[in-house]
Amino acid sequence: MAVTACQGLGFVVSLIGIAGIIAATCMDQWSTQDLYNNPVTAVFNYQGLWRSCVRESSGFTECRGYFTLLGLPAMLQAVRALMIVGIVLGAIGLLVSIFALKCIRIGSMEDSAKANMTLTSGIMFIVSGLCAIAGVSVFANMLVTNFWMSTANMYTGMGGMVQTVQTRYTFGAALFVGWVAGGLTLIGGVMMCIACRGLAPEETNYKAVSYHASGHSVAYKPGGFKASTGFGSNTKNKKIYDGGARTEDEVQSYPSKHDYV
């Protein structure tokens, strides 16, 4: 039950995280105009990964896409790539994890297969979250560098009288969405990996027990179970004799009313 809850929660957290990563990637407010030096501007600038926008106080907003690939900074391209990789991995992870969910039955899929799929999706979520966090952090670092560079030459005097105020940009809402979303995806991935350990059939030390059947006696001997870590092993626990006794893992592999959430 705890495994199912951990897996389900991991899935939900990852789902929210990936939705957040997608939202952050699409958002226009990755960097917003710093109003500290000019709080009374009638024009507000903000930029995203795909386009830059200008919002006038009158309510009109104009956005222009970056219609060039070669003309864009390498760092921006890198951030785009990281976010897209994060989304793709996350999406694949979600697809895999749906089939890996313990509460969903697909044919006669064994627990070890579900464990492997859970682990795979967990790793994908972790990498996806790391990609998003890395992408957002690279962009944030770029902003900080540019901010202090533009602060150094904030005013360029023209004839000593006229001032040209250079527009500085600070962290936009998308950065915070990206960081939180990346963190959630990462946490979801870790939860999936933890759930995987619970799903995987574990090695159990059974003591030798004698069962006296009518007719002849058969003894169960220890060591008849093949150890399985759940990390790639697809072998089911082997039975020496299929009498009336079942291992704990085998009992769980059949549907019960507790398996459906």
């Epitope: 105009q33 009374v40 024009v43 600038n45 006038e56 309510g59 009109f60 222009r64």
Partner: antibody
Framework: QVQLQESGPGLVKPSETLSLTCTVS????????VSWIRQPPGKGLEWIGV???????NYHSTLISRVTISKDTSKSQVFLKLSSVTAADTAVYYC???????????WGQGTLVTVSS | DIVMTQSPDSLAVSLGERATINCKSS????????????LTWYQQKPGQPPKLLIY???TRESGVPDRFSGSGSGTDFTLTISSLQAEDVAVYYC?????????FGGGTKLEIK
């Protein structure tokens, strides 16, 4: 079509509060900003302040302590209040709609307010 | 506050001739985000409210004759009437629409010579 009409008392006594109303039609006050501008007789234009679609306001730094701009969206009205008036506040007061580039694309006909005892 | 300075204060031009009015701002009105200059030109005829001619320094408002054109960038701007007509006699104002307060220039009175 877009129309703006200023109304209010034509004569205000010194130290009193000047109150004007701008009634608009043809556009929504939730979507567009409305500015107040004044023009003393024979002089140039002076921007007083603005109320934007979201209700936020900006005022001229020289008038900020005396001016208040508000609106009643349901009645499509914008209000200007200027306190502690003096003879220097005698002017034609205009209200105007803000458009692209923050430019004032539609103006009212203006109303002359004289400050005198 | 941004100070807008217009020159000349008054201008007399013959009908059909070119009229040029200048406007200078104390700070740049160029917005880096969209590379547009937030400067507006208005025309005010006697006894009438001002009328919008040009916004973004060079974009003509709909219905404005194409003899009116705006140019300039940063801090220096020009309004040009290519061929002066009798109905163009008015006072012309420039306005900063970039930073609050949205200050006006002192105005240029255009007359026929």
């Amino acid at each position: 079509q877009v129309q703006l009409q200023e109304s209010g008392p034509g004569l205000v006594k010194p130290s009193e509060t000047l109150s004007l109303t701008c009634t608009v039609s043809g556009f929504s006050l939730t979507s567009y900003g409305v500015s107040w501008i004044r023009q003393p007789p024979g002089k140039g234009l002076e921007w007083i302040g603005v109320i934007w679609g979201d209700g936020s306001t900006n005022y001229h730094s020289t008038l900020i302590s005396r001016v208040t701009i508000s609106k009643d969206t349901s009645k499509s009205q914008v209000f200007l209040k200027l306190s502690s008036v003096t003879a220097a506040d005698t002017a034609v007061y205009y209200c105007a709609k803000a458009g692209r580039g923050n430019a004032l694309d539609y103006w009212g006909q203006g109303t002359l307010v004289t400050v005198s005892s | 506050d941004i100070v807008m300075t217009q020159s000349p204060d008054s201008l007399a031009v013959s009908l059909g001739e070119r009229a040029t009015i200048n406007c200078k701002s104390s700070q740049s009105l160029l917005n880096s985000g969209n590379q547009k200059n937030y400067l507006t030109w208005y025309q005010q005829k006697p006894g009438q409210p001002p009328k919008l001619l040009i916004y973004w320094a060079s974009t003509r408002e709909s219905g404005v004759p194409d003899r009116f054109s705006g140019s300039g960038s940063g801090t220096d701007f020009t309004l040009t009437i290519s061929s002066l007509q009798a109905e163009d006699v008015a006072v012309y104002y420039c306005q900063n629409d970039y930073s609050f307060p949205l200050t006006f220039g002192g105005g240029t009175k255009l007359e026929i010579k």
